[in-house]
C-alpha cells in the first residue's frame, strides 16, 4: 500500500490522543534506555509502512502485536485516514486463516514496541533532518 | 461462532436522523475495535467511524459531527447515530468486530432521499 495520500494531520493526531498513550502502557515496567533504535523512517508514507510492518507482520519472537490495543487504533486510523487501505485490508483479511492468537508479551516484543515508538516520534517531526 | 446484526437502516429525508444497531452474539465484548463501514454502489468499502474498549473513538471528516458511535456493553451493542444525513450518506452500512478475525454483519441499507 502507498501511503502517500494519507490524511498524515489526522493520523498524527490520533497518535497524540491515545495510540501514544497505549504504546506507553504496553511499554511500562521497561527503561526507556533499555533497547536502541535501529530501525527508521525518511519522510512520513515512509514511517507510516514501517510502522505498520512492525505492527501487523508477525516477526520472530513476536507473533502477537496484532491483538494489542494501539495496534488496533493503528489500523483503524489507517483505514478511516488513508485512501483505500481499509480495502485492501478486508481483503487480506479475508484470505487470512480465522486463529485467535494468543497474547504474549516477550522482550522481543517490547523491543518491536520500542522501535515503533521511535518511528511514530519520527513521523510527527517529518521536517526534522535525519541524524 | 461470532454472530453480528445490523439493524435501523431505511428510507429518510435529507436532514433526517436514523440510528444504527449492531448485536453482537457469541463473544466476549470487553476487548474490541468496533468500526463501523459503509458501501456505496460501485465504490469501495470504507470505514467511517471506530469505537475502542476504553471509549476512544475515530470519526472520518464527512462525517464527523453528524455521527455518533457508541457501546453498551452490558448488551453486547454497538451504535451508530446519524443526523443530518445527507444523500451521499446512502449506502449499504456494516458493523465489523475486531476486523482483524474477520467478524462482519450482513450489512443494513440507509437511504437518504427526498
Known amino acids: 500500500y502507498d501511503f502517500t495520500n494519507c490524511d498524515f494531520e489526522k493520523i498524527k493526531a490520533a497518535y497524540l490522543s491515545t495510540i501514544s498513550k497505549d504504546l506507553i502502557t504496553y511499554m511500562s515496567g521497561t527503561k526507556s534506555t533499555e533497547f536502541n533504535n535501529t530501525v527508521s523512517c525518511s519522510n512520513r508514507p515512509h514511517c507510516l509502512t514501517e510502522i505498520q510492518s512492525l505492527t501487523f507482520n508477525p516477526t520472530a519472537g513476536c507473533a502477537s502485536l496484532a491483538k494489542e490495543m494501539f495496534a488496533m487504533k493503528t489500523k483503524a486510523a489507517l483505514a478511516i485516514w488513508c485512501p483505500g487501505y481499509s480495502e485492501t485490508q478486508i481483503n487480506a483479511t479475508q484470505a487470512m486463516k480465522k486463529r485467535r492468537k494468543r497474547k504474549v508479551t516477550t522482550n522481543k516484543c517490547l523491543e518491536q514496541v520500542s522501535q515503533l515508538q521511535g518511528l511514530w516520534r519520527r513521523f510527527n517531526r517529518p521536517l526534522l533532518k535525519q541524524q | 461462532e461470532v454472530q453480528l446484526v445490523e439493524s435501523g437502516g431505511g428510507l429518510v429525508q435529507p436532514g433526517g436522523s436514523l440510528r444504527l444497531s449492531c448485536a453482537a452474539s457469541g463473544c466476549i465484548f470487553s476487548t474490541y475495535f468496533m468500526g463501523w463501514f459503509r458501501q456505496a454502489p460501485g465504490k469501495e468499502r470504507e470505514l467511517v467511524s471506530a469505537?475502542?474498549?476504553?471509549?476512544?473513538?475515530y470519526y472520518a471528516d464527512s462525517v464527523k459531527g453528524r455521527f455518533t458511535i457508541s457501546a453498551d456493553n452490558s448488551k453486547n451493542t454497538a451504535y451508530l447515530q446519524m443526523n443530518s444525513l445527507k444523500p451521499e450518506d446512502t449506502a449499504v452500512y456494516y458493523c465489523?468486530?475486531?476486523?482483524?478475525?474477520?467478524?462482519w454483519g450482513q450489512g443494513t441499507l440507509v437511504t437518504v432521499s427526498s
Open positions: 469505537i475502542f474498549s476504553d471509549g476512544s473513538t
Open positions: 465489523a468486530l475486531d476486523w482483524n478475525l474477520n467478524r
